[in-house]
C-alpha cells in the first residue's frame, strides 16, 4: 500500500515538473511573441511614417503628372542605361504623348542644355520596327526622325526637342521613369 502511494506521489511530482517546464516554455514563447510584435509594430510604424512623409518622387527626380523622371549625370551605352534604371526600380523613359515629350525637352533645356539622352526605344533588327522596351509601338508622331546608318543595333535618344536614333553601343546620358506615388493623405 505504501509502495503504491509513493509511486503515485512520484508520478504526480513528474507531472508537476513537466507542467513547470511547459509553463516556462510558454512564458518564453510569450516573451518572444511580444518582442516580435514590438518589432512588427515598429517596422509598420516606420513604413507608415516614411510613406506619410514621402513625396511623390524620390530626391533628385522630376515630377510631371503621374510620372517621375531621373536625368542621369553619367554616360553609358543603352543596355547599361536600362540596367541603371532597373537598379532604381524604374525603366528607361517611355514617351507616351506629345505633352510628355514637350515636358521632357523643356526640362532638359533648363537642366543641361543640348545633350543626348537614351530613352527606352529600340529598333528590331529583322523587321526594322521601332518598339518601346515593354513591347508596345510608339505613336506615329513619336518615331525617331532619322534612320541610323549603323549595321549594329539601333536605339532611340532625345536631343533638344527631337527623337533621334543611334548605335546602341554609343555612350550617352539617359532618362529613367517610374510612376509617382499617389498621396493617400
Amino acid at each position: 500500500k505504501l509502495l503504491q502511494v509513493s509511486t503515485i506521489a512520484m508520478q504526480q511530482q513528474e507531472k508537476l515538473i513537466q507542467q513547470e517546464r511547459a509553463l516556462l516554455n510558454f512564458t518564453e514563447w510569450k516573451r518572444s511573441c511580444a518582442l516580435q510584435m514590438k518589432y512588427c509594430q515598429a517596422f509598420m510604424q516606420n513604413s507608415l511614417s516614411s510613406a506619410h512623409n514621402s513625396s511623390p518622387c524620390p530626391n533628385n527626380w522630376i515630377q510631371n503628372r503621374e510620372s517621375c523622371y531621373y536625368v542621369s549625370e553619367i554616360w553609358s551605352i543603352w543596355h547599361t542605361s536600362q540596367e541603371n534604371c532597373l537598379k532604381e526600380g524604374s525603366t528607361l523613359l517611355q514617351i507616351e504623348s506629345k505633352e510628355e515629350m514637350d515636358f521632357i525637352t523643356g526640362s532638359l533645356r533648363k537642366i543641361k542644355g543640348s545633350y543626348d539622352y537614351w530613352v527606352g526605344l529600340s529598333q528590331d533588327g529583322h523587321s526594322g520596327r521601332w518598339l518601346w522596351q515593354d513591347g508596345s509601338s510608339p505613336s506615329p508622331g513619336l518615331l525617331p526622325a532619322e534612320r541610323s546608318q549603323s549595321a549594329n543595333q539601333v536605339c532611340g535618344y532625345v536631343k533638344s526637342n527631337s527623337l533621334l536614333s543611334s548605335n546602341c553601343s554609343t555612350w550617352k546620358y539617359f532618362i529613367c521613369e517610374k510612376y509617382a506615388l499617389r498621396s493617400s493623405v
Epitope: L86, K87, G89, S90, Q133, D134, K178, Y179
Partner: nanobody, 116 residues
Framework: QVQLQESGGGLVETGGSLRLSCAAS????????MGWYRQAPGKQRELVAA???????AYADSAKGRFTISRENARNTLHLQMSSLKAEDTAVYYC??????????WGQGTQVTVSS
C-alpha cells in the same frame, strides 16, 4: 541574405514553349526590380526581361512578342513564359533581383536547350 532558385529549364524543340520560375527567399523586405538574364556559350550575359516593383516592364529586342515576364508578389516568385523558341535562345537563364540598396543578387541558373 537573399537566395534565388530557378526552375523550369530543359530541352525543347524549335517553336516550343517553356515556363521558367524563380523562387526568392531570405531577407527580402524591399525589391526594386526582378529580371532574367541569359548567357549563351562564349557570349556575354544579357538582360532578357525585367519587371520593377511598380510593374513596369523591359524586354530585350529578341524577347519582345515571344517572352512574357510576370511576378507573384505574395509568393516572391518570378516567371518567364517563353514561346516560339529558337535555337539561338539556348543558354543558361539566370534570375536576378535589385534590392532597395541597389544591390544585385543572382540565382545559380537553369539550362534551356532548344533543338532544331
Amino acid at each position: 541574405q537573399v537566395q534565388l532558385q530557378e526552375s523550369g529549364g530543359g530541352l525543347v524543340e524549335t517553336g516550343g514553349s517553356l515556363r521558367l520560375s524563380c523562387a526568392a527567399s531570405g531577407s527580402i523586405f524591399s525589391i526594386n526590380a526582378m529580371g532574367w538574364y541569359r548567357q549563351a556559350p562564349g557570349k556575354q550575359r544579357e538582360l532578357v526581361a525585367a519587371i520593377t516593383d511598380q510593374g513596369r516592364l523591359a524586354y530585350a529586342d529578341s524577347a519582345k512578342g515571344r517572352f512574357t515576364i510576370s511576378r507573384e508578389n505574395a509568393r516572391n516568385t518570378l516567371h518567364l513564359q517563353m514561346s516560339s523558341l529558337k535555337a539561338e535562345d539556348t543558354a543558361v537563364y539566370y534570375c536576378t533581383i535589385w534590392d532597395r540598396d541597389r544591390q544585385q543578387y543572382w540565382g545559380q541558373g537553369t539550362q534551356v536547350t532548344v533543338s532544331s
